[in-house]
């Protein structure tokens, strides 16, 4: 696992402890909470980040309308079970033996059940819609400038391949970023859209996960882009399985930023 060799730190994840006792005597950084070694040359998986967070001492319109199957993260934070590669296990359970199935971004996609609940496979979230509302500005941002800046951000800061940023929509004051990544499209070494979206979400909230880097300073042609609300929708390759009672209520998990 690579890391800054000179001082043994993890540039991409400050929720780690690093020591020079990895394979070949190299620097090895372990995620808090799980103790799993992470690859510091890329983003850490959302599952390991959530686990680290929970262990730490004690958020004809051009706009896309989310489909009826879009999931929003209503359950908030939990201490997840991660597989040996650091991905979410398909079935998650809490301390009181309440279990549920999650998708690849760790969002619940079934009703809650007991220990007999089966989750046969980890269903991939292949489409993420990041819905932002920016603070009032003197005028609207230029759409193409905004598009270019957000694509640059995902490419350079999160190392997400440009082909996975499907579109950037803008209708002042709402910005929507669409990330798409099918199982067949994701090659070894590619950053997962779920991980990129999580890093972006934490950046927007002023809780950057990067080591020693300043917070996110988003500017479009020099003009600060300040987000006051984010809402993230997750669409899975297989639609979620909720009871009809759940589907009659449209729950949203809002993140407010001040």
């Amino acid at each position: 696992h690579t890391a800054a060799q000179d001082n043994c730190t993890c540039p991409t994840n400050k929720m780690t402890v690093c020591s020079p006792d990895g394979p070949g005597g190299r620097c090895q950084c372990r995620a808090l909470g799980s103790g799993m070694a992470v690859d510091c040359s890329t983003l850490t998986s959302k599952c390991l980040l959530l686990k680290a967070r929970m262990s730490a001492p004690k958020n004809a319109r051009t706009l896309v309308r989310p489909s009826e199957h879009a999931l929003v993260d209503n359950d908030g934070l939990y201490d997840p079970d991660c597989d040996p590669e650091g991905r979410f296990k398909a079935r998650q359970c809490n301390q009181t033996s309440v279990c549920w199935c999650v998708n690849s971004v760790g969002v619940r996609r079934t009703d809650k059940g007991d220990l007999s609940l089966r989750c046969d496979e980890l269903v991939r979230t292949h489409h993420i819609l990041i819905d932002l509302r920016h603070r009032p500005t003197a005028g609207a941002f230029n759409h193409s400038d905004l598009d270019a800046e957000l694509r640059r951000l995902f490419r350079e800061r999160y190392r997400l391949h440009p082909k996975f940023v499907a579109a950037v929509h803008y209708e002042q004051p709402t910005i929507q970023i669409e990330l798409r990544q099918n199982t067949s499209q994701k090659a070894a070494g590619d950053v997962d859209i779920g991980d990129a979206a999580y890093y972006f979400e934490r950046d927007i909230k002023g809780e950057s996960l990067f080591q020693g880097r300043g917070g996110l300073d988003l500017r479009v042609r020099g003009e600060p882009l300040q987000v006051e609300r984010t809402l993230i929708y997750y669409l899975d390759e297989i639609p979620p399985k909720f009871s009809m009672k759940r589907l009659t209520h449209h729950h949203h998990h809002h993140h407010h930023h001040h």
Partner: antibody
């Protein structure tokens, strides 16, 4: 050369607490994990937990979480483990070891819990 | 928690023979396995780290192999001083665990 030197044997009564020390020398104390492992008579090795001296981040085996405390004093390059509410089955040799692959071990501290 | 299962529990061989000790993990742990030798009344001694990396001062007759879930410690030609208990240990994630040990005894 790297050395881990532990404190001497202890005899304790059930319900008491014991604190064992591990003094490190010959390397940068703050940059390597210190692990604690125990071995009951005639038994195998059991990992108790670990501490990273640089920031005192400690991780405990769930089995011991409510009874064990690990600390480190960087000024004297010494790690400590304290086990409370001792029971007879805590009788064991307690070892400290360095790094994720336990490349250097202390000589062991025998803790006997007996009424 | 990752469970490490060592086999056999006891291995009876003669000096000069080849010893093959096995350690199986309950899930994929890459190469995060380490091997130790322990003699009565002594602290364990590291023999192999990260499945196959040799340790300074350890005789070359000790070697390790494997990745994922199956690991092997091989002693190419047993010397009298090699008869001891051998443990594997993983450092993949917390909690770290040890195998139950393989006792290598003289036949």
């Amino acid at each position: 050369q790297v050395q881990l030197v532990q404190s001497g044997a202890e005899v304790k009564k059930p319900g008491a607490s014991v604190k064992v020390s591990c003094k490190a020398s010959g390397y940068s104390f703050t940059t390597h994990w210190i692990h604690w492992v125990r071995q009951a008579p005639g038994q195998g090795l059991e990992w108790i937990g670990t501490i990273f001296p640089s920031n005192a981040y400690a991780v405990y085996n769930q089995k011991f979480r409510d009874r064990v405390t690990m600390t480190a004093d960087r000024s004297i390059s010494t790690a400590y483990i304290e086990l409370s509410r001792l029971r007879s089955d805590d009788t064991a040799v307690y070892y400290c070891a360095r790094a994720s692959y336990f490349d250097y071990w202390g000589q062991g501290t025998t803790v006997t819990v007996s009424s | 928690e990752i469970v490490l299962t060592q086999s056999p529990a006891t291995l009876s061989l003669s000096p000069g023979e080849r010893a093959t000790l096995s350690c199986r993990a309950s899930q994929n742990i890459g190469t995060s396995i380490h091997w130790f030798q322990q003699k009565p009344g002594q602290s364990p001694r590291l023999l192999i780290k990260y499945a196959s990396e040799s340790i300074s001062g350890i005789p070359s007759r000790f070697s390790g192999s494997g990745s994922g879930t199956d690991f092997t410690l091989t002693i190419s030609s047993l010397e009298p001083e090699d008869f001891a208990v051998y443990y594997c240990q993983h450092s993949h994630s917390w909690p770290f665990t040890f195998g139950q040990g393989t006792k290598l005894e003289i036949k």
